[in-house]
């Protein structure tokens, strides 16, 4: 039985040209996290963090994606095209797969404040 919950940074905004941290947190389960996948809105994989093998940043994103902090992902040099949904997929043992959603809005305005709070989707 899957008892865990994915908490995410929910809906966040950040400035064009800036950076943002995408963060998911698995709680309420003792399951072991074996792998975390990060996907973009078009379902293309940005990165994988395998507990035994390490991080893999897909080549198309290597110049703008940095691993961490933790199991999270840092997007850099944001463009307006980065606006959209991002998904974290947690492969766990023995529970199975958990999935979280984050919506990122990239703003032109210099007054955009990076708002990030954990929420349960």
């Amino acid at each position: 039985m899957m008892t865990g919950t994915i908490e995410t940074t929910g809906n966040i905004s950040a400035k064009k040209g800036g950076s943002v941290i995408l963060q998911c947190h698995l709680s309420s389960t003792m399951a072991q996290v074996t792998q975390v996948n990060w996907e973009q809105h078009d379902h293309s994989l940005l990165a994988i963090r395998n507990a035994e093998l390490g991080w893999h940043i897909y080549p198309a994103f290597k110049d703008r994606v940095a691993p961490g902090p933790g199991l999270g992902l840092t997007l850099q040099s944001l463009t307006m095209n980065d606006t959209g949904e991002y998904f974290c997929t947690y492969h766990t043992y023995p529970d199975g797969t958990y999935r979280g959603r984050i919506f990122l809005e990239v703003l032109e305005s210099s007054v955009a404040e990076h708002s990030a709070r954990f929420q349960i989707p």
Partner: antibody, heavy 119, light 107 residues
């Protein structure tokens, strides 16, 4: 053109040592995990280990069959991968391939170099 | 360690025919499975990764399927150049392991 070319194979006596090299070209070497895989004559492929990429600190992992005897290293300035093999045994006789991995599957392979361990 | 069991060990087929090779993982590996083709005296070549994604330049007569512990590689409309050995490999944990191989021969 993406290419991997191994060298350094040959005949070695049991207990001896040998170093294999793999010259990489056509891609950004530091972005990729680099692996060694071997294949004894007429047998299956066996993953020996890898050295991680720059983002993962160039750390290494090895299979149990070679851990402590084999060492993987890389010269990033020259785009060369190495496999230092010590305390060689007859069962180490095989064709040795270097392979680039993307998300831990092997998307580019070298042509292979042959090691024979025999007295 | 995750063990990969391939079957059959060998099979013979005719040009134009269809074959299916199966691979079983000893543990759940989601869709993290790759298939390789190796011709006699040559290096292996990546065919499929993530269980069903064809590698660049691989013809559509090859198809991969499966998830969890059971996987298969299907080759339709066999061509003379398709004969050789095929290996599966999981890309999910350490150590990375291959199946024992399937030798596809011309009938």
């Amino acid at each position: 053109d993406v290419q991997l070319v191994e060298s350094g194979g040959g005949l070695v006596q049991p207990g001896g040592s040998l170093s294999l090299s793999c010259a990489a070209s056509g891609f950004t070497f530091t972005d990729y995990y680099m692996n060694w895989v071997r294949q004894p004559p007429g047998k299956a492929l066996e993953w020996l280990g890898f050295i991680r990429n720059k983002a993962n600190g160039y750390t290494t992992e090895y299979s149990a069959s070679v851990k402590g005897r084999f060492t993987i290293s890389r010269d990033n300035s020259q785009s060369i991968l190495y496999l230092q093999m010590n305390a060689l045994r007859a069962e180490d006789s095989a064709t040795y391939y270097c392979a680039r991995s993307t998300a831990w599957y092997f998307d580019v392979w070298g042509t292979g170099t042959t090691l024979t361990v025999s007295s | 360690d995750i063990q990969m069991t391939q079957s059959p060990a060998s099979l013979s087929a005719s040009v134009g025919g269809t074959v299916t090779i199966t691979c079983r993982a000893s543990e759940h590996i989601y869709s993290y499975l790759a298939w390789y083709q190796q011709k006699q005296g040559k290096s292996p070549q990546l065919l499929v990764y993530n269980a069903k994604t064809l590698a660049e330049g691989v013809p559509s007569r090859f198809s991969g399927s499966g998830s969890g512990t059971q996987f298969s590689l299907k080759i339709n409309s066999l061509q003379p150049k398709d004969f050789g050995s095929y290996y599966c490999q999981h890309h999910y944990g350490n150590p990375l392991t291959f199946g024992a191989g399937t030798k596809l021969e011309l009938k």
